[in-house]
Interface confidence: low
């Protein structure tokens, strides 16, 4: 059955209640230079409009503080109102390493990110940090790597490993949950000139992730005791016509091309899904596509296999799919899939269908295919036009969390966290935020607060209290380090 009655029950005490933000652009300088500059200035407002130092006058200074960054104050105010236990945000690789290698490290950017993490910890909010978050408009790569063919160039994977190592070294004492790459399975939207470009870029992204995981596993895990994975875009697929076999096959094929493409090599075999490889090969043989999945060497399979500590899924909606034979040598046509927009379904302004039961089906599919592992939903949300009373978002959150709870209570899926997407919206973008672009709170915040404080949807008389030891204590030493380690 698709929809089942709501359940009453609670998530475990160590469940991560999170909110996700995309790339945080680091502020280059703290907003309060007067605290570190002992000189007094007067502003020549009517003349040359410059600041002129007053000679012979020295002011008391104080060390720079994290809260001198205006952005951080804003972030913290929003996070405090969200009452979350975890905050997922992404670093800007291009800001941290403008040259793409370790020859020019932007220490100020790293200090900014360290401040975001450490100030969050003071509020009891742990960070899940994403190292690389490409967006469709912008690849987010350092300029030199972009000009050297980006992810089509295998050396970008080596550069990523060095960047990851730097971040683990600089932030790993405070950060215990890492995402290497956000939605590498959606980079097909950018590397779409040909299927071979798409599969080649994907291969290099897989290698980049695995190199970073291996580096962490050996060099940093013994002392930092953290966990590393990558976030896959993981929408569920249903046959548009449940009575058509070809539609069922198309739905499974969608999941193979979308999720298994990355999950199979990392979680299971070290190689691409046989179903995907065979489907592309059969189209190749029939002259319908010249695409081919890369052949992996034994060393590459060794490198990829098992390089995840947990499963991280970004789930937004369910797609209704049907089979349609498509000619052409691109990833989209290799799949032979057509999407159907079901106008009878509740949908968002950007046509995202609200299909709560899809997330439960997804979680069961992942467990069935990849075993009983810890799963985090690292982004889940909907766009809602309302600037104050965002009812669609409240409905979405309530219903999707209900299905996640069913997966936990009934299906015994090891779900460890849910990260709502996203903290604040950006100007002229679909409205996914809990806060407007000018930081005004929406009413869905109170709804999410209530779910968090209740740990789900408890029975009337059940306690939502957790003892200190049961709560999410993944970073007990972090607060100590925040105080002791210079920022």
């Amino acid at each position: 059955k698709e929809s089942t009655p709501d359940v009453q029950g609670q998530f475990p005490c160590d469940f991560s209640w999170g909110v996700t933000e995309s790339v945080l652009k680091p502020e280059s300088v703290a907003s309060s230079p007067q605290f570190s500059d002992p000189h007094l200035y007067v502003w020549n407002a009517t003349g040359n409009r410059l600041l002129h130092r007053v000679e012979g006058v020295r002011l008391k200074t104080r060390p720079a503080q994290c809260t001198d960054f205006v952005n951080i104050k804003k972030q913290l105010e929003m996070l405090a109102r969200m009452k979350v236990t975890h905050y997922r945000f992404a670093l800007d690789w291009a800001s941290v390493l403008p040259t793409g290698n370790l020859s020019a490290v932007n220490r100020q950017a790293l200090r900014y990110y360290r401040c975001v993490v450490s100030e969050g910890l003071k509020l009891g909010i742990s960070a899940m940090v994403t190292l690389y978050y490409p967006t469709h408009a912008h690849l987010g790569l350092p300029e030199p790597l972009l000009h050297a063919d980006g992810w089509l160039n295998p050396s970008t994977a080596e550069a990523f490993q060095a960047y990851a190592g730097l971040c683990f070294q600089e932030l790993g004492d405070l950060v215990k949950l890492w995402i290497t790459i956000n939605e590498p399975n959606r980079l097909s939207d950018i590397y779409n000139r040909s299927g071979n470009d798409t599969y080649g870029a994907a291969h290099n992204l897989l290698v980049a992730h695995a190199l970073a995981w291996r580096l962490y596993d050996r060099q940093f895990r013994p002392s930092q005791r953290g966990a590393v994975s990558l976030s896959l875009h993981a929408d569920w697929a249903e046959p548009a016509n449940p009575y058509a076999d070809s539609h069922w096959r198309a739905a499974e094929r969608f999941l193979q091309f979308e999720i298994a493409w990355f999950a199979e090599p990392l979680f299971k075999t070290g190689d691409y899904p046989a179903a995907m490889r065979e489907y592309i090969a059969s189209k190749h043989r029939r002259g319908l596509s010249s695409s081919a999945l890369p052949r992996l060497t034994e060393a590459e399979r060794r490198l990829l296999k098992g390089t995840v500590d947990f499963c991280a899924l970004n789930h937004f909606t369910t797609r209704f799919v049907m089979h349609e034979q498509l000619a052409g040598s691109r990833y989209d046509s290799d799949r032979d899939i057509q999407f159907l927009q079901d106008i009878t379904r509740l949908s968002s302004p950007t046509r995202l269908a609200v299909i709560p039961w899809g997330v439960r089906k997804l979680l069961r599919w992942v467990r069935r295919n990849y075993g009983d592992m810890d799963i985090y939903i690292t982004a889940s949300g909907i766009d809602d036009q309302a600037l104050e009373d965002d009812r669609l978002r409240k409905y979405y959150l309530g219903k999707y969390l209900q299905e996640v709870l069913k997966a936990y209570l009934i299906d015994k899926v090891r779900i460890k966290g849910y990260y709502a997407f996203k903290l604040a919206e950006e100007k002229s973008k679909p409205r996914f935020g809990f806060f407007t672009s000018d930081f005004k709170a929406k009413s869905s915040i109170q709804f999410y607060n209530k779910v968090i404080s209740s740990r789900g949807f408890p029975f009337e008389n059940s306690s939502s209290r957790c003892s200190q030891t049961q709560e999410n204590t993944e970073c007990t030493v972090c607060l100590f380090l925040v105080q002791k380690k210079p920022l």
């Epitope: 291996r214 060099q219 060794r302």
Partner: antibody
Amino acid sequence: QVQLQQSGPELVKPGALVKISCKASGYTFTRYDINWVKKRPGQGLEWIGWIYPGDDSTKYNEKFKGKATLTADKSSSTAYMQLSSLTSENSAVYFCARSDYYGSRSFVYWGQGTLVTVSA
Amino acid sequence: DILLTQSPASLAVSLGQRATISCRASKSVSTSGYSYMHWYQQKPGQPPKLLIYLASNLESGVPARFSGRGSGTDFTLNIHPVEEEDAATYYCHHSGELPYTFGGGTKLEIK
């Protein structure tokens, strides 16, 4: 916790062969290399080679090719080293040690060592 | 093969003082920003114990009096202040390329 348990001491005759074992526990056996290291009295440590139990691939120090053969049994999480055509030069303590090929490749976990004595 | 030359072959250090052991590689063991040089301590009848990995990283559970530094071809292990239990043989080990090799060892005696 991670443990590597090696087989007991061996007294063997020149020209014979010996097979020593290293049983791993506390981690996923197929995910990490098992290295073998030789230590002779009054001398330093020598790396013999590694086996990756995930696919049974091996790498040897040229000096030990033909002398040492590394194998692994996934079902029992045990790695083996066979030494053939033994001479007094092969009398030593042999250690197994775990490393991660794509990490730093240092050896964190070691077996207790197996003493092999070659004597007529 | 990369030859690792350790010096001195032996040294005696008073309790509480500093012990410095150096290791020189016949060619660089540094690549992609990491130096694949490690240090081990071995006591009689025991397997070696990893102290420092990747030139300067302290292995979990190892006292902070052990430290490592260096890159390229020259590396040092420092122990300060030396304690009674530090009497042992110390080896450097590179894993930059195959075959991996070890230094000849330095025997540390406590006066």
